[in-house]
């Protein structure tokens, strides 16, 4: 398991049809972790997607950040993550948003707030043991 925070640049960006697969393990004492799709590599970059499972408050939050300000939070149905359990998430980019798939079921559709073409970095952090990030 690799350490977090994990950052991988996406020099070619992502486009509709791009799929990211993130898999790892939620530690037994986890509070929360996140997957961010960022528009730059510098600190404070805009976030086209902030995917934030919160084990401590039993919710999964989706949001975006633009010019330092967070947008309106969206929440997925239930929490398909458990402390001490492995997980696998697919994030599928489409022309109208990001579809988050957990297990084998669509979990939430987060409509684009920032242009998809701006995404340049994937970041995984927080209380998570990351196994791998794959893209195609």
């Amino acid at each position: 398991m690799s350490n977090v925070p994990h950052k991988s640049s996406l020099p070619e960006g992502i486009r509709p049809g791009t799929v990211l697969r993130i898999r790892g393990l939620v530690p037994p004492n986890a509070s929360r972790f996140h997957v961010n799709l960022l528009c730059g590599e510098e600190q404070g970059s805009d976030a086209a997607l902030h995917f934030n499972p919160r084990l401590d408050t039993s919710e999964v939050v989706f949001n975006s950040k633009e010019q330092g300000s967070w947008g309106r939070e969206e929440r997925g149905p239930g929490v398909p993550f458990q402390r001490g359990q492995p997980f696998e998430v697919l994030i599928i980019a489409s022309d109208d948003g990001f579809k988050a798939v957990v297990g084998d079921a669509q979990y939430h559709h987060f409509r684009h707030r920032l242009p998809l073409a701006r995404v340049r970095l994937v970041e995984v952090g927080g209380d998570v043991q990351l196994d791998s990030v794959r893209i195609f």
Epitope: L10, P11, E12, T18, R23, P86, D104, R134, I135, F136
Partner: nanobody, 119 residues
Amino acid sequence: EVQLQASGGGFVQPGGSLRLSCAASGAGSRSDVMGWFRQAPGKEREFVSAISGFWGWTTYYADSVKGRFTISRDNSKNTVYLQMNSLRAEDTATYYCALGGAPGQTGYWGQGTQVTVSS
């Protein structure tokens, strides 16, 4: 170098079936996640299905093909299949297989195989 060879496309009437195959070869071709995508003329590339090895196989489908398409994998042949049943005119597209790579590689892509559904 990774090579992906897709085959099995063709012309079929609505309601018919096709089975696509994609064989991966070369150094680095043993990825734990493979998938199928499609692109119709004048449209964006669209995710169709993926199969991921993670304590057993997990399969994923676009809503538009769920219940009609089935993805599977033969590890001994390093090949992924897409069984397409109950085909519709809107399934007409060029189908591509892909191998998940680390970010920065943006994965590996095969050449397309054309599927045409028409009466």
